[in-house]
Amino acid sequence: MAVTACQGLGFVVSLIGIAGIIAATCMDQWSTQDLYNNPVTAVFNYQGLWRSCVRESSGFTECRGYFTLLGLPAMLQAVRALMIVGIVLGAIGLLVSIFALKCIRIGSMEDSAKANMTLTSGIMFIVSGLCAIAGVSVFANMLVTNFWMSTANMYTGMGGMVQTVQTRYTFGAALFVGWVAGGLTLIGGVMMCIACRGLAPEETNYKAVSYHASGHSVAYKPGGFKASTGFGSNTKNKKIYDGGARTEDEVQSYPSKHDYV
């Protein structure tokens, strides 16, 4: 039950995270005009990964796409790539995790297969989240660098007579959406990996109890033919420990309403 909840929650958290990564990638407000300590202008500039926009005080907003590929800064291209890789990995991860969900039965899919798929999707979500966080952080670093550079030469011009005010840009809403979304995807991925451990079946299908005779290193395994062939009781195998006869508590898997759709 706990495994199903962890897996389900991981899936939902990752789904929200990936939706956030997609939203952040599409948003225009990656960088917004810095209004603090700047001359008040009648226009407000903001930029995204794909286009830049200008909103006038008239309410008129004009957006222009970056129609060049080679003319764009390498950092911007890198951020685009990271975000797209994050989205693609996340989307594949979601697809895989749907089939891996414990509450969904597909044919005679074994728990080991579901465990592997859960782990795969978990890793994909982790990488997806890291890609988004990295992309947003690279862009934020680029902004900080440009901000201080433009602050250093806020006014440029000939002899100080005619001045050109450089527009400074600060963090836009998309950065925060990206960070949060990347974090959620990462958390979701970790939860899926944790759930995978609970889903993974052990190698053999019997309970092992070790009997240690003093002076001998012989392990006696009760159950005879039935145990060794895997027939008989529905108990799962346990690890053999040194130092006396002991067994872990039995964990039995009963069909529940959550095992069927």
Partner: antibody, heavy 117, light 113 residues
Framework: VQLQESGGGLVQPGGSRKLSCAAS????????MHWVRQAPEKGLEWVAF????????YYADTVKGRFTVSRDNPKNTLFLQMTSLRSEDTAMYFC???????????WGQGSSVTVSS | DIMMTQSPLSLTVTAGEKVTMNCKSS????????????LAWYQQKPGQPPKLLIY???TRESGVPARFTGSGSGTDFTLTINTVQAEDLAVYYC?????????FGTGTKLELK
């Protein structure tokens, strides 16, 4: 599109006056509005701007703290409350609609304010 | 505040002539975001409110005759009237539409010979 100013007249120095601008023929609540004045035989001087939703508001340095611009969108009316009036505030006051490029495409006929003792 | 300097202060022309008037701003009115210059030109005839001719430095307002042309970028702008007509006699103002407080030029008075 029509803009009609009213409320002008003779005011004593230090006195107050409230100008109104009635708008018609367009969706008033969707446009920012300006007040511009022109002293006798002088050039144009921008006074204030109020955006469609009443925020932000900007004022010329010469009137900051003395003039207040406001609007009543349901009544399609723009206001300019003038206090602590000085002789240099004597002018024809125009209201104008904000347009693309923050230019002013439609202007009222103006309302004359004379500050004199 | 942005200073808008217009030249000449007055122009005396004959009908049919080509007229050019200039406007210089103390700071660039070019917005890097959309590469537009936030400068407008107005025409004011005696006893009338101003009339918008040009916005974004070169975009003609609808209904304005094609003989009016705006040009320039950054800090230097020009209004050209290709063939002046009698009804063009007025005062022409340029305006900074970029920085608050918005500021107007001193004006150029167009007169007939």
């Amino acid at each position: 599109v029509q803009l009609q100013e009213s409320g002008g007249g003779l005011v004593q120095p230090g006195g107050s006056r409230k100008l109104s601008c009635a708008a018609s023929g367009f969706s008033f609540s969707s446009f920012g509005m300006h007040w511009v004045r022109q002293a006798p035989e002088k050039g144009l001087e921008w006074v204030a701007f109020i955006s469609s939703g009443s925020s932000p508001i900007y004022y010329a340095d010469t009137v900051k703290g003395r003039f207040t611009v406001s609007r009543d969108n349901p009544k399609n009316t723009l206001f300019l409350q003038m206090t602590s009036l000085r002789s240099e505030d004597t002018a024809m006051y125009f209201c104008a609609r904000n347009y693309y490029g923050n230019a002013m495409d439609y202007w009222g006929q103006g309302s004359s304010v004379t500050v004199s003792s | 505040d942005i200073m808008m300097t217009q030249s000449p202060l007055s122009l005396t022309v004959t009908a049919g002539e080509k007229v050019t008037m200039n406007c210089k701003s103390s700071q660039s009115l070019l917005n890097g975001g959309n590469q537009k210059n936030y400068l407008a030109w107005y025409q004011q005839k005696p006893g009338q409110p101003p009339k918008l001719l040009i916005y974004w430095a070169s975009t003609r307002e609808s209904g304005v005759p094609a003989r009016f042309t705006g040009s320039g970028s950054g800090t230097d702008f020009t209004l050209t009237i290709n063939t002046v007509q009698a009804e063009d006699l007025a005062v022409y103002y340029c305006q900074n539409d970029y920085f608050y407080p918005l500021t107007f030029g001193t004006g150029t008075k167009l007169e007939l010979k």
